[in-house]
Amino acid sequence: KAMHVAQPAVVLANSRGTASFVCEYASPGKATEVRVTVLRQADSQVTEVCAATYMMGNELTFLDDSICTGTSSGNQVNLTIQGLRAMDTGLYICKVELMYPPPYYMGIGNGTQIYVIDPEPCPDSD
């Protein structure tokens, strides 16, 4: 079953290569288990950036080597992606799945365009 997912259109990463955005979903039921996946679309190719499964009221469970962190509050997920460089600029899509209890719902956002600008190296000082 389909579900609406909303996310911002554009986000600019900070000078340390960190970008944050909110992924909000319209839950049609009372889910206890939610899975959030961040996908990156660039040059018509889609790759998985990170994924987390969490319980309502609990923290997001990203694997230890993930570049993503996040928190949840109600039907909102606050996602942070770290370690970004200019080459990582692209469309980052939030996918939300209500895993339990049935029925299963899935929704995909329109994507957040994340712009990453590599910082200029500091000039040598004499």
């Epitope: 288990e33 499964t53 969490y54």
Partner: nanobody, 113 residues
Framework: QVQLVESGGGLVQPGGSLTLSCAAS????????MAWYRQAPGKEREVVAG????????NYGDSVKGRFTISRDNAKNTVYLQMNSLKPEDTAVYYC??????WGQGTQVTVSS
């Protein structure tokens, strides 16, 4: 293969206590949020408690808050549910859950005088 084996269930009087254990094997236990669910006869399965991978975050169903405590030992691949001040309405089959992939077979808890 993946196994979640619950133990510790049984018959207890109202006001009594029980501790359920769930021993996990066949998957990377520390990578999973763990939970306890329960299902009473004729009712839907409901969440009792959940605990994050590190054990740093827990959450509870409204009906058990202040009475039940979930904990985990990642070194032993085990999650626990300490149940105090048990009530007849806590009678159910209690299931261990590796969110959102695996279920245990369940252990029966009966609260009756």
């Amino acid at each position: 293969q993946v196994q979640l084996v619950e133990s510790g269930g049984g018959l207890v009087q109202p006001g009594g206590s029980l501790t359920l254990s769930c021993a996990a094997s066949g998957f990377t236990f520390s990578s999973y949020t763990m939970a306890w669910y329960r299902q009473a006869p004729g009712k839907e399965r409901e969440v009792v408690a959940g605990i994050s991978r590190s054990g740093g975050t827990t959450n509870y169903g409204d009906s058990v808050k202040g009475r039940f405590t979930i904990s985990r030992d990642n070194a032993k691949n085990t999650v626990y549910l300490q149940m105090n001040s048990l009530k007849p309405e806590d009678t159910a089959v209690y299931y261990c859950r590796a969110v959102s992939d695996y279920w245990g077979q369940g252990t029966q808890v009966t609260v009756s005088s």
